[in-house]
Amino acid sequence: KSEMPQPVSIQDINHRVWVLQDQILIAVPRKDRVSPVTISLISCRHVETLEKDRGNPIYLGLNGLNLCLMCAKAGDQPTLQLKEKDIMDLYNQPEPVKSFLFYHSQSGRNSTFESVAFPGWFIAVSSEGGCPLILTQELGKANTTDFGLTMLF
């Protein structure tokens, strides 16, 4: 089990990268002047208490920014949010902090991120560029839920 967050670069199958804009993560085409965020990824240390065969439960943070991705209900719809949080604080907690956890599933070079708190909801980006990251239940339709991960350092 990893005890240090792994820095990764994430892009979708349309080669859009994640960028922080006004405390919101958006997906934009990779260009010269674009500064993609580096994502920190760490496995949950309580993996044995979570569902098996759904993927590797991970916390996702923004490297060096003390911000983590989490899922919370807005009305009756789960939404993706950034919260000020140290990823190692989540990692060290005595129980899985499910609102911040995602099942990371890999198929070939593609990765998906399913909310642990809201099973069936996946991190996605709209097929149009320059849109915020969202949670969706609809796979492979108007939204892209497949991402490519590149390990850094």
């Epitope: 569902e51 907690q93 005595p94 129980e95 499910k98 708190a117």
Partner: antibody, heavy 121, light 109 residues
């Protein structure tokens, strides 16, 4: 409001089993962890184990592994503790408690009223 | 398995300050033990006071504070009120299970 309501007192013979229930209301049990703790007469609290009601996974104190079984019925928001091979030293008040993540930490914030289990021949 | 020890009883004057401690037989208590404190008033349900060593539960008065003190978890009550007379229990996390202490009976006299 948040409430954990437990089943009534039980008297059991040594070697028997007991099943205590804890019905949750005012919150979604799938969003928290439910723990069982006991207090023998004149003693401190003793942690037995916990369940994640959303998934059904459990953890137990090694001392109670094999004798304690925690289960849940999410359709009725009820968590159960079954305790087997009872001995006189298992006589205690058994409590369910919610362990809830709020802000930055987990809290044992809400507790049931307790269920007295008396083991006597 | 660790044994968690608390003062069996303590007395504080109304308006006074008192510190309850929680010691582990397995060594110094650290933030990794995520100390919790719960209160049991006579005739009432247990109620959570502190989580994660020093985080107050919602609605808990500011006169209750949690900390680490000399290798022990501590609960300090500043400006004790008569209604704070109760039993106080700590719980410490040890990598895959919790251990509760024997409790402290606090008298406000």
């Amino acid at each position: 409001q948040v409430q954990l309501v437990q089943s009534g007192a039980e008297v059991k013979k040594p070697g028997a089993s007991v099943k205590v229930s804890c019905k949750a209301s005012g919150f979604n049990i799938k969003d928290t962890y439910i723990h069982w703790v006991r207090q023998a007469p004149g003693q401190g609290l003793e942690w037995i184990g916990r369940i994640d009601p959303a998934i059904g996974t459990t953890r137990y104190d090694p001392k109670f592994q094999g004798r304690a079984t925690i289960t849940t019925d999410t359709s009725t928001s009820t968590v159960y503790l079954e305790f087997s091979s009872l001995r006189s030293e298992d006589t205690a008040v058994y409590y369910c408690a919610r362990l809830h993540y709020f802000g930055n930490n987990f809290f044992f914030d809400y507790w049931g009223q307790g269920t007295l289990v008396t083991v006597s021949s | 398995q660790a044994v968690v020890t608390q003062e069996p009883s303590l007395t504080v004057s109304p308006g006074g300050t008192v510190t309850l401690t929680c010691r582990s037989s397995s060594g110094a208590v650290t933030t990794s033990n995520y100390a919790n404190w719960v209160q049991e008033k006579p005739g009432q349900l247990f109620a959570g006071l502190i989580g994660g060593t020093n985080d107050r539960a919602p609605g808990v008065p500011a006169r209750f504070s949690g900390s680490l003190l000399g290798g022990k978890a501590a609960l300090t009550l500043s400006g004790a009120q008569p209604e704070d007379e109760a039993d106080y229990f700590c719980a410490l996390w040890f990598s895959n299970h919790w251990v509760f202490g024997g409790g402290t009976k606090l008298t406000v006299l």
